[in-house]
Interface confidence: low
């Protein structure tokens, strides 16, 4: 049975709390629900950084910081509709993650 892909969660992992230009940054994107194979795309300021496919556990992407700050997001697509994560904003002083849950209208 096909399972709709859920909205992925993007996690940024840095080697230290105070990140600096040149640091290696690890991006992890995972949709907790979705089948079969999920294609993950990573974005910086809406520009595609790269993509990776995974059956489970999400996907990783590594990059070296070349800018002082920026907005990162990822997208999960299982061929039955894509979902994009909340944007994670990276500052030189650390990470700020913005996520939202359901609300009643």
């Amino acid at each position: 049975v096909a399972v709709p892909v859920s909205r992925p969660v993007l996690t940024l992992r840095a080697p230290r709390a105070q990140v600096a230009v040149g640091d290696l940054l690890e991006l992890h994107c995972e949709a907790l629900r979705g089948s079969p194979l999920i294609l993950y795309q990573f974005y910086h300021e809406d520009v595609t950084l790269g993509n990776s496919s995974a059956l489970s556990g999400g996907a990783f992407f590594n990059l070296s910081l070349t800018a002082e700050h920026g907005n990162y997001s990822c997208e999960a697509d299982n061929g039955l509709g894509a979902q994009r994560s909340e944007t994670v904003t990276l500052y030189l002083t650390g990470l700020t993650e913005n996520r939202s849950g359901p609300v009643a209208t």
Partner: antibody, heavy 118, light 106 residues
Framework: QVQLQQSGPELVRPGVSVKISCKGS????????MHWVKQSHTKSLEWIGM????????NFNQKFMDKATMTVDKSSTTAYLELARLTFGDSAIYYC???????????WGQGTTVTVSS | ENVLTQSPAIMSASPGEKVTMTCSAD?????IHWYQQKSNTSPKLWIY???KLASGVPGRFSGSGSGNSYSLTISSMEAEDFATYYC?????????FGSGTKLELK
């Protein structure tokens, strides 16, 4: 705040087509897929299908495959549902609804009433 | 298609009364979500992920269940709770709703 504004009611003859719209505002339109749901007295709530607001890819309930066409216009942040070859059984309220991270509909449009009458 | 069967279809209750409605799925699902709908309005997300209350939903509401069987309970009915409640599954295509339970004033 998040809003989904749908087009007004439609009174149409059998056999014709109708196109209804759903304008999303108050959020990043391309980050959320849009779904369409039919509500009739006989069948309660029925999922018609969804469209990715970013890619335009669609996924249908097989029951509506030959009835419905879904499109999206990113520039105007509007999703469209076209219903073809209308019959009396297509008379219903049609809702657009935003698909959230939790695999559910978190916001709904106000609904568009389609009445098929000769 | 995963058919969701709600019961009862219509339930009469009085303010202050405890009510429970059920939703049975043909096939096992990870989660059930509940929507509340009042006359001439759109459905509103009420309970998500089986037991979590959506923003603004009173604490007298609760949800439970797993697998094929789920329920929504109102511990003490209030006037504003009279409405139709639909269960919904987003775990598999086609997405499906239950036929609804209408709560009426006794």
């Amino acid at each position: 705040q998040v809003q989904l504004q749908q087009s007004g009611p439609e009174l149409v003859r059998p056999g014709v087509s109708v196109k209804i719209s759903c304008k999303g505002s108050g959020y990043t339109f391309t980050h959320y897929a849009m779904h369409w749901v039919k509500q009739s007295h006989t069948k309660s709530l029925e999922w018609i299908g969804m469209i990715s607001s970013s890619s335009g890819n669609t996924n249908f309930n097989q029951k509506f495959m030959d009835k419905a066409t879904m499109t999206v216009d990113k520039s105007s942040t509007t999703a469209y549902l076209e219903l073809a070859r209308l019959t009396f059984g297509d008379s219903a309220i049609y809702y657009c609804a935003r698909w959230s991270y939790y695999a559910l509909f978190d916001y709904w449009g106000q609904g568009t009433t389609v009445t098929v009458s000769s | 298609e995963n058919v969701l069967t709600q019961s009862p279809a219509i339930m009469s209750a009085s303010p202050g009364e405890k009510v429970t409605m059920t939703c049975s799925a043909d096939s096992s699902v990870d989660y059930i979500h509940w929507y509340q709908q009042k006359s001439n309005t759109s459905p509103k997300l009420w309970i998500y992920d089986t037991s979590k209350l959506a923003s603004g939903v009173p604490g007298r509401f609760s949800g439970s269940g797993s697998g094929n069987s789920y329920s929504l309970t109102i511990s003490s009915m209030e006037a504003e709770d009279f409405a139709t409640y639909y269960c919904f599954q987003g775990s598999g295509y086609p997405l499906t709703f239950g036929s609804g339970t209408k709560l009426e004033l006794k």
